[in-house]
Each structure stands twice: as structure tokens, then as C-alpha cells.
Interface confidence: low
């Protein structure tokens, strides 16, 4: 299916709009730090080339390929040197080592200031004035601070901006309509960001065998009642389709998740009752249902797995002649039974079996020897129900912030050499799970639970990688996709790090505290209670909870008196005092 | 491509027998586990039977037992089910999938027994 012109071709499948805004996209996260201004007049000379292109596939330069279309634009960029420093090397070289060499500059945690919400009317104003460029300043600056998120899936984010603006900028009440919308909007691709980074991570760092493992068992989940074939042609194409936007190559992403929507929709039949929503629907939303569509219901009379797997004197046979579509068809089998189990467990399970059968098969009796096989799955089956279960317990028992709280410390204790920051961001994370997941009914929890923290995790990971301070974190997020969670939870306290010093900058505190806001409170919190465990990593929960209850009392008072900065100034040396001795 | 092509159905007295056959291309026949499985206009699809990849182990539902039988021909890779003492409840449209899928995956057969 070749074409005289690649961008031609783009151009006219993906129409004008999208074309545009997905350039943008694909620009946004590659020169994270240029001004707004500067990636549209690119974004204009990219589209005012490609229409030409349409007009005359041979004119000059159309037959070229994307990434050398792209690569030369970005190149072009004058403040590309002092801006990005070694990034402006990539200009060197030649596709498609350039595009490559891009990638590997993306930054997942970009120097960019917190996004500061202005005020209602500001931006119905803005909104008014040029709702063109209101989205586009969406898109990129949403673009900018998440270099891997999915880019069709943004563009369905921002036909929801939009939507959210045309309808509650002509509200009554224009704050009320809007704000709750923008939020569900920030927690939405908060979620959507993070998930799109761990499927990339899968492909970069493990291989496009352990995405498709991936895929075939949540595949296989949503949609139990199809074959085993309409299963592998959908993982293949939707492989297909997140190889080419975690490698940048947005257009042709797009572009092929919307053949996938279409072929999902006209065959429905054969893969899920659960799809004839989502395919009424304009594309963006389709294409955004179907990925998050229920899981279908799975047929009654299914018999039992032991047959063809462990009973049948063919395993072996099998499993020698198609390893991987053996291997493949077993996952199905097992996820489609299995809509209770989080995908990882289900991977874990199958590595389990390609274990047993890559030692039994070469044994004397190989039937005897994987006969236990599903035994041994009890083990793998369990721990995750556990931890679930009792993390369940606890958030139940403390509430939001102080299962949060205890995640800090437990997490702190584990990895000490970790940032501040990092640790915050990502144990307050992992404490969303109890929200999240905790309320769902018992079959839903571990799906939810342990596919979540995956994804919380691969952020630990991400930015670890970028900054690598801990041989341990560095050991759970490479070894094995599948078992870092596992690797995360049996940590223990480091026994051979060596405390930090006590800093009584760290933990003053001025009047300032007392305008943040209630989130921004609990973070002020959360980093001081880190850094008190890094200071002394073996400090009791008793002697924690001591400190971090007068602190809060400290903060109310100070926050209640008359000269707020005085009282700060007095009381905040007595807090610290007081600190050191009950944790001496 | 993954192909399964049935044949030999057809309309056929209650008591009366036929034989279908699932002709397979496009994978290693050999090495999965096959099944039956019909479906009635309006209602959900039935699992029939299912044969393992060497044909050794056989299952079969409740409302058949006795009457099909399954088997195959690795060599020829094609699915077999031998129909016997056909009921006027066994009129149905028969397909083959792969491992134990109840799902449609190709246009089936249709098998009418009138009584």
C-alpha cells in the first residue's frame, strides 16, 4: 500500500484539522521547551507543504519520508543549540538514526512551570476571541509536559475542552458548569498519560512480544466470546498502531487507529456485544469507547483448560512447533476464563508455564513432570489477592492521606536514595488505588489494583532511569515488566543506607503554608514526612504518627493566630526541637 | 490469514446422519486444540465438542453425547463431526473455531433436521 506521497496521503485520510493539531502534537513533544508561537508557524509551513503535496504528489520534495520532513523542520529551529544543548546534535545525523536520537531527548519530567489555571471569565474570553488558538495552546502545552501521550487520544481531549468551554461559557453560573469539567479533564489524562507511558515502556524497553502478551490477555478479557484468531489479528494491529506513536510517528498512529475503530465496528459480531455504543459514535469518541469498552460476558459452557494443556499427551508436541502461538493461545484461554485477574498476574502465569514446559519437555516423562503445572499457579494466585486484600483493610481503616502517608514511609524505607519529589509523587499515586479500586466489588479489585500500581510504578521507573540513584529500583524496573510490582512489594527496609543529615531548613515553615491549598498542604506534609524518614529510616509508626500529629497541630495554630509569620517564627524551632527528641 | 471453511451440511430427516468437515489454512492445524459449536437463529451460540491437537481427547455436550462424534485428520487439516440419530433440536448453523472458542469466526454450515 505504498504512495507517491506519504504526506499527501496523511493529509487526505486524516482531513486538515487533525492533520494539524497532530503535527502540533508531534512537535510539542519533541522541542518541549520552544514557545507556543514558535511550533505553530511550523505547524503552518508543515501544512501549507503537505497541501501542496496533495495538489501535485511529484512536486519537489513530497515523496520524502515523514521523519525527514519533520526532522528537517525542527532542525531549522535557530535556538535549537542554546535551548536543548547535546539535542541539537540529532541534526546531524541522518534518518533514521535522527528521529531515533530525538526520541531518546524526550523528557518525561520537563523544567516547565505547574499549568496555573486563570480565572473563569479569562478564559471564556480567550475562548471567544480565538477558539483556534485557545485549543491549540491545549494541545500544546498539554503536548510539552507529557511527551508520550497517546496523540489520537488528545485530540479526543481536546474536542472535550472545547465542549466544555462552548457550553459553559454561556452558563449562568460559568464557574460552576466549568470548573468540575476541567478537573475531570486534568485527572482523566493525568491517567490516560500515565498508562500510554507504561505501554511505551513495554515496547522500548522489553519488546514488542512483551506488548503483545500484554494485549492478548486484556484483549482476551474484553472480549472472551472471540476466537483466538480475531484475537491475534487485533493485538497485531493494535501493536501496530502504539509502536508508531511511542516512535513518534503520530500521523500514521492516527491514522491506523481509526482503520482499527472501523474494523472493529464492522465486525462486531465476532468480537464483542459490547461495541454497538461506541460505534454510533464520531470517530474520536469511538475510537476512545472501544478502548474503554466493558468487558464482554464470557461463555457459559466453557470446559475445563487441564485437557488441552496439562492432560494431553501433545503438550509438548505443541508447544515445540509453535512456541509462541501455543504460549499465546494458553494466555487467551486462561484471560478469557479470568476477568478477575490483573493482567500482570495473568502474564506472570503463563511465564510460569512456558517455565515448566521449557524444563519438562526435555525431562525423561514430560507429562509427569508438568502434570502439577496449575499447582503451581495457586502460589502466583494468591499474593496478589493478599496484598489487595490487605491494603484494602488499611485504606479502609485510615482514610485517603494517611494510607498515603504510610505508603511515603514504607516506599521511603525501601528506596531512601530516591528524590524527595519522586517519592511523594508516586506514593501519594499509589494511595489513589485505595479510592479507585478498593470500593469495586471483590472480582473487579485485583484487575484494578495491580494493573493501576503497574502503571504508578513504570513513573518510578521513568524518572528513576533519568536520574538512577538505587541499584534496587534500577534491579525491580528492568528485570522483569511483569514482576516489578512483586519486585517493588518484597523490598525491604535498606539496610545500607546511611541517614541524612539533619537539615532544620527542611522543616521550616513560614505563613505562606496557610494560603495553599488543602492538596498542596497534604504535599508540604508528605515531603516533610519523608524527609523525616530519611532522616531516621527506623523510626516506629508510633514515633511518625507522634510527629506528623504535632505538626499539623503547629501548622493550625500558627495558620489561627493573629501575626502568622511571628507565630511561625517562634513556634516552628520548638516543632523541630521536639521532633529530634521524641525520634532520638 | 486464518481460514475455516465448513461444509456438508444440509436438510435431513430426524433419525438420519451427516457429516461435516472443517477444512483449515493459514496456522499450524496441528498444533490446536478444534471445536464444534452451533448457533440458532436469535440465541447465543452452543459449545458442541472439542478434540484436543492430537486428537486423543475428545469432550462433548451434554444434549449430543452418543449421537456426534468428533475427530480430525492432521495431514489433511480438516475438523470432522460425524452426526448421527439427528433431532429436530439439532437444526442450527455449525461452525469450527480454534481451541475452545464459542465465538464466529467463519459463515458455518447450516444443518436442518425436519421431523
Known amino acids: 500500500d505504498t504512495h507517491k506521497s506519504e504526506v499527501a496521503h496523511r493529509f487526505k485520510d486524516l482531513g486538515e484539522e487533525h492533520f494539524k493539531g497532530l503535527v502540533l502534537v508531534a512537535f510539542s513533544q519533541y522541542l518541549q521547551q520552544c514557545p507556543f508561537e514558535e511550533h505553530v508557524k511550523l505547524v503552518n509551513e508543515v501544512t501549507e507543504f503537505a497541501k501542496t503535496c496533495v495538489a501535485d504528489e511529484s512536486a519537489e520534495n513530497c515523496d520524502k519520508s515523514l521523519h525527514t520532513l519533520f526532522g528537517d523542520k525542527l532542525c531549522t529551529v535557530a535556538t535549537l543549540r542554546e535551548t536543548y544543548g547535546e539535542m541539537a546534535d540529532c541534526c546531524a545525523k541522518q534518518e533514521p538514526e535522527r528521529n531515533e536520537c530525538f526520541l531518546q531527548h524526550k523528557d518525561d519530567n520537563p523544567n516547565l512551570p505547574p499549568l496555573v489555571r486563570p480565572e473563569v471569565d479569562v478564559m471564556c474570553t480567550a475562548f471567544h476571541d480565538n477558539e483556534a488558538t485557545f485549543l491549540k495552546k491545549y494541545l500544546y502545552e498539554v503536548a510539552r509536559r507529557h511527551p508520550y501521550f497517546y496523540a489520537p487520544e488528545l485530540l479526543f481531549f481536546a474536542a472535550r475542552y472545547k465542549a466544555a468551554f462552548a457550553e459553559c461559557c454561556q452558563a449562568a453560573d460559568k464557574a460552576a458548569c466549568l470548573l468540575p469539567k476541567l478537573d475531570e479533564l486534568r485527572d482523566e489524562g493525568k491517567a490516560s498519560s500515565a498508562k500510554q507511558r507504561l505501554k511505551c515502556a513495554s515496547l522500548q524497553k522489553f519488546g514488542d512480544r512483551a506488548f503483545k502478551a500484554w494485549a492478548v490477555a486484556r484483549l482476551s478479557q474484553k472480549f472472551p466470546k472471540a476466537e483466538f484468531a480475531e484475537v491475534s489479528k487485533l493485538v497485531t494491529d493494535l501493536t501496530k498502531v502504539h509502536t508508531e506513536c511511542c516512535h513518534g510517528d503520530l500521523l500514521e498512529c492516527a491514522d491506523d487507529r481509526a482503520d482499527l475503530a472501523k474494523y472493529m465496528c464492522e465486525n462486531q459480531d465476532s468480537i464483542s456485544s459490547k461495541l454497538k455504543e461506541c460505534c454510533d459514535k464520531p470517530l474520536l469518541e469511538k475510537s476512545h469507547c472501544l478502548a474503554e469498552v466493558e468487558n464482554d460476558e464470557m461463555p457459559a459452557d466453557l470446559p475445563s483448560l487441564a485437557a488441552d494443556y496439562v492432560e494431553s499427551k501433545d503438550v509438548c508436541k505443541n508447544y515445540a512447533e509453535a512456541k509462541d502461538v501455543f504460549l499465546g493461545m494458553f494466555l487467551y484461554e486462561y484471560a478469557r476464563r479470568h476477568p478477575d485477574y490483573s493482567v500482570m498476574l495473568l502474564l506472570r502465569l503463563a511465564k510460569a508455564y512456558e517455565a515448566t514446559l521449557e524444563k519438562c519437555c526435555a525431562a525423561a516423562d514430560p507429562h509427569e513432570c508438568y502434570a502439577k503445572v496449575f499447582d503451581e499457579f495457586q502460589p502466583l494466585v494468591e499474593e496478589p489477592q493478599n496484598l489487595v486484600k490487605q491494603n484494602c483493610e488499611l485504606f479502609e481503616q485510615l482514610g485517603e492521606y494517611k494510607f498515603q502517608n504510610a505508603l511515603l514511609v514504607r516506599y521511603t524505607k525501601k528506596v531512601p536514595q530516591v528524590s524527595t519529589p519522586t517519592l511523594v509523587e508516586v506514593s501519594r499515586n499509589l494511595g489513589k488505588v485505595g479510592a479507585k479500586c478498593c470500593k469495586l466489588p471483590e472480582a473487579k479489585r485485583m484487575p484494578c489494583a495491580e494493573d493501576y500500581l503497574s502503571v504508578v510504578l513504570n513513573r518510578l521507573c521513568v524518572l528513576h532511569e533519568k536520574t538512577p540513584v538505587s541499584e534496587k529500583v534500577t534491579k525491580c524496573c528492568t528485570e522483569s515488566l511483569v514482576n516489578r510490582r512483586p519486585c517493588f512489594s518484597a523490598l525491604e527496609l535498606d539496610e545500607a543506607y546511611v541517614p541524612k543529615a539533619f537539615n532544620a531548613e527542611t522543616f521550616t515553615f513560614h505563613a505562606d503554608m496557610c494560603t495553599l491549598s488543602e492538596k498542596e498542604k497534604q504535599v508540604k506534609k508528605q515531603t516533610a514526612l519523608v524527609e523525616l524518614v530519611k532522616h531516621k529510616p527506623k523510626a516506629t509508626k508510633e514515633q511518625l504518627k507522634g510527629v506528623m500529629d504535632n505538626f499539623a497541630a503547629f501548622v493550625e495554630k500558627c495558620c489561627k493566630a493573629d501575626d502568622k509569620e511571628a507565630c511561625f517564627a517562634e513556634e516552628g524551632p520548638k516543632f523541630v526541637a521536639a521532633s529530634q527528641a521524641a525520634l532520638a | 490469514e486464518v481460514q475455516l471453511v465448513e461444509s456438508g451440511g444440509g436438510l435431513v430427516q430426524a433419525g438420519g446422519s451427516l457429516r461435516l468437515s472443517c477444512a483449515a489454512s493459514?496456522?499450524?492445524?496441528?498444533?490446536?486444540?478444534m471445536s464444534w459449536v452451533r448457533q440458532v437463529p436469535g440465541k447465543g451460540p452452543e459449545w458442541v465438542s472439542a478434540?484436543?491437537?492430537?486428537?486423543?481427547?475428545?469432550r462433548y455436550a451434554e444434549s449430543i453425547k452418543g449421537r456426534f462424534i468428533i475427530s480430525r485428520d492432521n495431514a489433511k487439516k480438516t475438523l470432522y463431526l460425524q452426526m448421527n440419530s439427528l433431532k429436530p433440536e439439532d437444526t442450527a448453523v455449525y461452525y469450527c473455531?480454534?481451541?475452545?472458542?464459542?465465538?464466529?469466526g467463519s459463515q458455518g454450515t447450516q444443518v436442518t433436521v425436519s421431523s
Open positions: 473455531t480454534i481451541g475452545q472458542s464459542t465465538s464466529r
Open positions: 493459514g496456522f499450524t492445524f496441528g498444533s490446536f486444540g
Open positions: 478434540i484436543d491437537s492430537g486428537g486423543t481427547d475428545t
